[in-house]
């Protein structure tokens, strides 16, 4: 099939006092090969501080996955979710408050 770019959605949830869990979800993409990872201060966040979901079919012939990490509240600006799929890429900030950010990438 032809390439279908992912929809990327970053959410935040309370983890413990002073911390939040930020989750970056990519959905509705094809083919299944994708890079989804968190960056802190512009460099790679170490793998042992990130949790990845499996890349799973979502029932529409496309795929979905996620990556999450725990960060200190107030330091959200220092983190971005990086997505690379089929030669294209995008970066996605952590939303403020409890809002969600939805992005298709544009490249």
């Amino acid at each position: 099939g032809s390439t279908v770019p992912p929809m990327v959605n970053v959410t935040r949830s309370e983890a413990s006092e002073g911390n939040i869990t930020v989750t970056c979800r990519a959905s509705s993409f094809y083919p299944r090969n994708i890079i989804l990872t968190w960056r802190q201060d512009g460099v790679s966040l170490s793998h042992d501080t990130q949790q990845w979901g499996d890349v799973l079919p979502d029932g529409n012939g496309t795929y979905q996955t996620w990556v999450a990490t725990r960060i200190c509240r107030g330091e959200e600006q220092r983190f971005t979710c990086y997505m690379e799929h089929s030669g294209n890429h995008s970066t996605h900030p952590v939303p403020s408050g409890n809002s969600h950010h939805h992005h298709h990438h544009h490249h």
């Epitope: 201060d41 790679s44 971005t80 900030p93």
Partner: antibody, heavy 119, light 107 residues
Framework: DVQLQESGPGLVKPSQSLSLTCTVT?????????WNWIRQFPRNKLEWMGY???????NYNPSLKSRISITRDTSKNQFFLQLISVTTEDTATYYC????????????WGQGTLVTVSA | DIQMTQSPASLSASVGETVTITCRAS??????LAWYQQKQGKSPQLLVY???MLADGVPSRFSASGSGTQYSLKINSLQPEDFGSYYC?????????FGAGTKVEIK
């Protein structure tokens, strides 16, 4: 557009301190980004020295950690480099630059200022 | 620290030729790579980020590729304004490090 301008003495004596200023226009250094110092030695090797970020957090190259300090004056939208106990090996062109948090590459640099360490 | 090794150190080429510069990292940097051009007496200028993405305003005769530890920058149909020095820089982890540079001279 973000613009950066380095300033400071062009000549420093060995064992003294090197102090440089980067003046930023077009963007507040407290809004976002990491504000960096990079130097280029006479034979063109580039070295990342460290940064101070929008919130005042610093991160230094371990090779310089005992000698470097990066500070800021938010009221003047400036950040500073201090390097103590300099030697002739610190002779270089010093650049200030910044990066956004989507990746630590440097989209714009100041014009650079040459600092010579000599007795 | 990750070391960046660039080759060649210098090259001579004619206008209209194609040149390729390579950069090898001492460890896997997962496409966390940038390229810069520097002309004599000027500041470095960003050409490429995320290993393959051309920065705004960079002519399409420039292209970049690579993965893992091996990356390259290619200039098709070299133009007079392309002469100067080229540097790679990784941003996989701190400290950020640069290659030693490749000087492209007029033959």
């Amino acid at each position: 557009d973000v613009q950066l301008q380095e300033s400071g003495p062009g000549l420093v004596k060995p064992s003294q301190s090197l102090s440089l200023t980067c003046t930023v226009t077009g963007y507040s250094i407290t809004s976002d980004y990491a504000w960096n110092w990079i130097r280029q030695f006479p034979r063109n090797k580039l070295e990342w020295m460290g940064y101070i970020n929008y919130s005042g957090t610093t991160n230094y190259n371990p090779s310089l950690k005992s000698r470097i300090s990066i500070t800021r004056d938010t009221s003047k939208n400036q950040f500073f480099l201090q390097l103590i106990s300099v030697t002739t090996e610190d002779t270089a062109t010093y650049y200030c630059s910044y990066y956004r948090y989507d990746g630590a590459w440097f989209p714009y640099w100041g014009q650079g200022t040459l600092v010579t360490v000599s007795a | 620290d990750i070391q960046m090794t660039q080759s060649p150190a210098s090259l001579s080429a004619s206008v209209g030729e194609t040149v390729t510069i390579t950069c090898r990292a001492s460890g896997n940097i997962h496409n966390y790579l940038a390229w810069y051009q520097q002309k004599q007496g000027k500041s470095p200028q960003l050409l490429v980020y995320n290993a393959i993405m051309l920065a705004d305003g960079v002519p399409s005769r420039f292209s970049a590729s690579g993965s893992g530890t091996q990356y390259s920058l290619k200039i098709n149909s070299l133009q007079p304004e392309d002469f100067g020095s080229y540097y790679c820089q990784h941003f996989w982890s701190f400290p950020l490090t640069f290659g030693a540079g490749t000087k492209v001279e007029i033959k």
